[in-house]
Each structure stands twice: as structure tokens, then as C-alpha cells.
């Protein structure tokens, strides 16, 4: 086949090689860009910048090599459109630095930067960490900083990500209140900061105020939905990004719902309780306190991370007619109490006509040290015989 006369020539089924001296000064309009998985560029001294627009449309790119060229600057967002990039070779260019943001979000198996006049500063602390942790084949390159010695020897004591402190109200927050949060940002070379409020939705009206180094956030007219929702403050500098999340506890009274008993492997009287702070619970059976044992006890389902409501069961193991009756769940917190009752019938009384039959509702010699109110948290399995029953 005749040699390819173009600046860039196909290489394999989805590769492109651009090696003709000085033919490129940008990567716009590369032929067949959308299907490329491999791009090899060499001897392009006019190619000095790599920016977001340069790699637009290269969504399938996995290997990018730009070597022995004039690359001086790679934009922090240069690889935004190439999320599948796994090998990046930028050796023997004119790079003095490379932002941590450039590689953030990529799963690079290999990053080659040897032969660049790197300048040791906190902006390369991330690369030093890669070297320390053996990532991306960096240690093998024995990277040097121009006139400063090995990257590995760069002092890094002062190279920290920003420090964040979020102040939340000490006092109890009630539904309808306005809440002021303040995020104090400290650190060198602060670049950007802000709030992430994606979880809040309709939980409050949001007003942002201030800027670095002190960001304010007012949550107006809060609802109980704000509970368990993360409010996150973030800040970035040349070393990296820091985030701190807080939650605002909005007090509201206990509420409770009971549902009809269902037979699974054991019997379950399903319930839901809500309230902030989390309510203490107590069960009554036919009006008397029900002492929990391994035969009858409260079992919570795994809670949803972002809501206060808890779902669970009063688990009854092998219940008989003596367990038939009225079950009441009492829930209380400092802001109110609630109760719900339900009748449950597990088995007909086989001795209905014999009033002499003993009914073992409880066995008095057992001392129950009930820490009633402490939630019994259900973990990741629903064991068949764990549970619960004769009253």
C-alpha cells in the first residue's frame, strides 16, 4: 500500500496516527473521530494546548498518545468528553504541570509524563501521591522536576486540600424555621467553593450568600423532609477537593401506623413509625405491656438513608390462640406521642370449650430487662428463625 500522505493516517480498524512533522496545531476535525479508540500523535511542535473542544466527539477513545510535541498546557476539563480513556501518554512535551482535575473521573491504567520539564509545586502533589501509591505506572518513570530533583523528594507538608468547617445551629430546629449554615474554608490557593444541595428538593427554600472564605446558606421555612438530607459544602485548590456534609435535624412529633398481620415464615405485624428525634416504642397486648423475648420482638427493616420513617415488624414466632388479641404500638418523642392498634388472630382456640385450659400468656419467672425504645435494627438478611413469639 502507498504511504499515507495526510497529516493523520488510519492505523488498524479504529486507530489514527499523526506523525508528519508539524502538521497539527489542534485536534479539531480529526477524520473518523467518533469511532476512534486509539490516537497517536508525534512530532507536532505546534500542538501546544489541549482543551475541552479538542476532544469533543472522541467518546470512544481509550488510548491517547501525544509525544515529542510542543504540548505546554492541558486544560483541567480536557478529557471531559473521553470518559473511557485508560492510557494517556504525554511524554517528551513541554508540560510544567498537570492539574489533578485533568485525570479526575478517569480510570487511567497508565499515565506517562516522563521527559517533561515538570515544576515541583503543590499542584503536583496528586502525582506524587500516585507515585507513592504505585498508580498508573508512575513510579517506574522516576519523574524529575526541572532543576529541582526527583518528584518523590518534593516537600509536601504544606500541600493540603482545603479545610472546611460547617456551622449548624445548636438549638432545636422546628418545622417552619429558617436555618443559617456557614461554611468556613481555610487553606492555600483556594480556587472555588460552593454548596451541593441536590438532596433538598422541596425540603426548604434555599438562599446562598457570601463567597470564599465564608459561604452562607439559608434554608427557609424548613419541612420535616429536611431530616437525613445531606447539605454539602465543597472547596477546591490546586491540590484537590474537599467536601463536608451535614444534616439538619428538624424536630417533629412521633407518628405510627400498624398494618394487618401477615404470615411469612413467621408472623409479622407490620408497622411504620416516624418522628424526630426517633421515637421510643412500646407494645401492648390486650392493654398490658408486652415483654419482648426471642419469640416475640420488634424487628426493623434496613432504614432508608435519607428518611426518618422506620418500617418493621412485631415478629411472632409460632403464635397460638393465646397470642390472638389486640396489639397496640405506642410511639413517643419529646414533641408528641402516637399509638395505633390492630386485632390479630393467629390460630383458633382448640380448647374453646374447656375454660380450665391454662393460657401461658407470660411465664412470670422470666425477668425482662427491656430497654424499650432502643430500635432493633434489622440487617441485611431476614433470618427465618430469628424471631419471636409467645407473649
Amino acid at each position: 500500500a502507498a504511504p499515507c500522505p495526510d497529516a493523520c493516517c488510519p492505523h488498524g480498524s479504529s486507530g489514527l496516527r499523526c506523525t508528519r512533522d508539524g502538521a497539527l496545531d489542534s485536534l479539531h476535525h480529526l477524520p473518523g473521530a467518533e469511532n476512534l479508540t486509539e490516537l497517536y500523535i508525534e512530532n507536532q511542535q505546534h500542538l501546544q494546548h489541549l482543551e475541552l473542544r479538542d476532544l469533543r466527539g472522541l467518546g470512544e477513545l481509550r488510548n491517547l498518545t501525544i509525544v515529542k510535541s510542543g504540548l505546554r498546557f492541558v486544560a483541567p476539563d480536557a478529557f471531559h468528553f473521553t470518559p473511557r480513556l485508560s492510557r494517556l501518554n504525554l511524554s517528551f512535551n513541554a508540560l510544567e504541570s498537570l492539574s489533578w482535575k485533568t485525570v479526575q473521573g478517569l480510570s487511567l491504567q497508565e499515565l506517562v509524563l516522563s521527559g517533561n520539564p515538570l515544576h515541583c509545586s503543590c499542584a503536583l502533589r496528586w502525582l506524587q501521591r500516585w507515585e507513592e501509591e504505585g498508580l498508573g505506572g508512575v513510579p517506574e518513570q522516576k519523574l524529575q522536576c526541572h532543576g529541582q530533583g526527583p518528584l518523590a523528594h518534593m516537600p509536601n507538608a504544606s500541600c493540603g486540600v482545603p479545610t472546611l468547617k460547617v456551622q449548624v445551629p445548636n438549638a432545636s430546629v422546628d418545622v417552619g424555621d429558617d436555618v443559617l449554615l456557614r461554611c468556613q474554608v481555610e487553606g492555600r490557593g483556594l480556587e472555588q467553593a460552593g454548596w451541593i444541595l441536590t438532596e433538598l428538593e422541596q425540603s426548604a427554600t434555599v438562599m446562598k450568600s457570601g463567597g470564599l472564605p465564608s459561604l452562607g446558606l439559608t434554608l427557609a421555612n424548613v419541612t420535616s423532609d429536611l431530616n437525613r438530607k445531606n447539605v454539602t459544602c465543597w472547596a477546591e485548590n490546586d491540590v484537590g477537593r474537599a467536601e463536608v456534609s451535614v444534616q439538619v435535624n428538624v424536630s417533629f412529633p412521633a407518628s405510627v401506623q400498624l398494618h394487618t398481620a401477615v404470615e411469612m415464615h413467621h408472623w409479622c405485624i407490620p408497622f411504620s413509625v416516624d418522628g424526630q428525634p426517633a421515637p421510643s416504642l412500646r407494645w401492648l397486648f390486650n392493654g398490658s405491656v408486652l415483654n419482648e423475648t426471642s419469640f416475640i420482638f420488634t424487628e426493623f427493616l434496613e432504614p432508608a438513608a435519607n428518611e426518618t420513617v422506620r418500617h418493621g415488624c412485631l415478629r411472632l414466632n409460632q403464635p397460638t390462640h393465646v397470642n390472638n388479641g389486640n396489639y397496640t404500638l405506642l410511639a413517643a418523642n419529646p414533641f408528641g406521642q402516637a399509638s395505633a392498634s390492630i386485632m390479630a388472630a393467629f390460630m383458633d382456640n382448640p380448647f374453646e370449650f374447656n375454660p380450665e385450659d391454662p393460657i401461658p400468656v407470660s411465664f412470670s419467672p422470666v425477668d425482662t430487662n427491656s430497654t424499650s425504645g432502643d430500635p432493633v435494627e434489622k440487617k441485611d438478611e431476614t433470618p427465618f428463625g430469628v424471631s419471636v413469639a409467645v407473649g
Epitope: S294, Q318, T371, E377, P383
Partner: antibody, heavy 118, light 107 residues
């Protein structure tokens, strides 16, 4: 697989206390109550009590109410039984046990032999 | 408490024999009864729960029966590994109680 690990033996003096451990593995610790059973040499089995690993709720048989104290360390998946004011009558093997898929003791520890002797 | 009374206290038999151990509850426990086998120096092992359900891995020569207050465990065609002490236990609420045991010895 489910395991309940107990130390083999404890030698204690009369009047002293001893804490027995039962380390659970192979299942979700907080999903099953832990029970303790006493067996004196050459004698039968005697249920002492039970504890809910989630919230520390305990039930004891009357005669062990002032003798045994059951506790839990969720962080290490370990149940403990403290026996106090020991007398020679407390010399026995103490087992921890848990229910299987039904309320019967499908899983037992190896037992800890407690010897009370001056 | 529910008292569990086991009989006989001891029993001698030969390999191949069939034996029956009985257990009486002081009150109605429906079918909530378990049987355990224990060998010298070992932990008890669950054989049967809910009167007649064999635990995992238990050979079919073991069978349980009964309800209410009267229960029995039958072992057909005794094997050398069957000798030991057998306990019944109710699982009808706490406190849980065991029978005093039946020692099955080789004749």
C-alpha cells in the same frame, strides 16, 4: 458457616467474678438472639437467659437473675456473660447458642468450663 | 415454668436395635418440642424441632412424634454413633426448659 467461638476453660476463686465470651461469625450477628445454657458435670442442660444483640434487651430465668449478666459488643460480634459471686455450685460448662431457621438451638458454642476452686 | 420430664433416665441397647425415648410436658406445648443428642465432652446437637422435623443432616432412622404434652423420639436400627445422651426441650416461649436427659448406652 455459622460459628460460635468460646474459650475452653476458666479457673476462678470463690466469691470472684468471671466474664465468658462468645464470638459469633458466619451470619448477621444482630439478627439472632444469643442464649446461654449451663451444664454441671454429669448433669443436664439448664437455660440461663437470652439477649438481643441489637438493643441489649435481656431475659433471664429467675434463679440466674442475680448471678448472670448478659451483654453484647456489636463491634466485635461478641456476646458476654458475667457470672458473679461464684461458688462451687457454679462450676459447670457454659454454652452459648443460637436458633437456626426455627426456634431450636441449631448452633452451639464449644462451651467454656468454669471451675470455681480455692 | 413448663417442666419437661424425660424417661427412661438411662437405656442399654445394641447396634441394630430400635429404641424409644419419651418426654412429657407439664402443660400443653402443642408441637413445640425439640430433641438434642450430646456426646461426652461435646456440645449438644439438634436432631429434631417442632416435634418431628429432622434437622439438617440428621439420618432418617431418627423420628419424632407427639403433641400437646406427650412426645417421643424413636431411633430405628441403632448405629454405633447414636450412643450418647438425649435431651428434649420445649420451644414454646421463654423460659426454655430441658428434660433431665436419657443416657443411651451400648449393651
Amino acid at each position: 458457616q455459622v460459628q460460635l467461638q468460646q474459650p475452653g476453660a476458666e479457673l476462678v476463686k470463690p466469691g470472684a467474678s468471671v466474664q465468658l465470651s462468645c464470638k459469633a461469625s458466619g451470619y448477621t450477628f444482630t439478627s439472632y438472639w444469643i442464649h446461654w445454657v449451663k451444664q454441671r458435670p454429669g448433669q443436664g442442660l439448664e437455660w440461663i437467659g437470652e439477649i438481643n444483640p441489637n438493643n441489649g434487651l435481656t431475659n433471664y430465668i429467675e434463679k440466674f437473675k442475680n448471678k448472670a449478666t448478659l451483654t453484647i459488643d456489636k463491634s466485635s460480634n461478641t456476646a458476654y456473660m458475667q457470672l458473679s459471686g461464684l461458688t462451687p455450685e457454679d462450676s459447670a460448662v457454659y454454652y452459648c447458642a443460637k436458633y437456626g431457621n426455627y426456634v431450636a438451638f441449631a448452633y452451639w458454642g464449644q462451651g467454656t468450663l468454669v471451675t470455681v476452686s480455692a | 415454668d413448663i417442666q419437661m420430664t424425660q424417661s427412661p433416665a438411662s437405656l442399654s441397647a445394641s447396634v441394630g436395635d430400635t429404641v424409644t425415648i419419651t418426654c412429657r410436658a407439664s402443660e400443653n406445648i402443642y408441637t413445640y418440642l425439640a430433641w438434642y443428642q450430646q456426646k461426652q465432652g461435646k456440645s449438644p446437637q439438634l436432631l429434631v424441632h417442632n416435634t418431628k422435623t429432622l434437622a439438617e443432616g440428621v439420618p432418617s432412622r431418627f423420628s419424632g412424634s407427639g403433641s400437646g404434652t406427650q412426645f417421643s423420639l424413636k431411633i430405628s436400627s441403632l448405629q454405633p454413633e447414636d450412643f450418647g445422651t438425649y435431651y428434649c426441650q420445649h420451644h414454646y416461649g421463654v423460659p426454655l426448659t430441658f428434660g433431665a436427659g436419657t443416657k443411651l448406652e451400648l449393651k
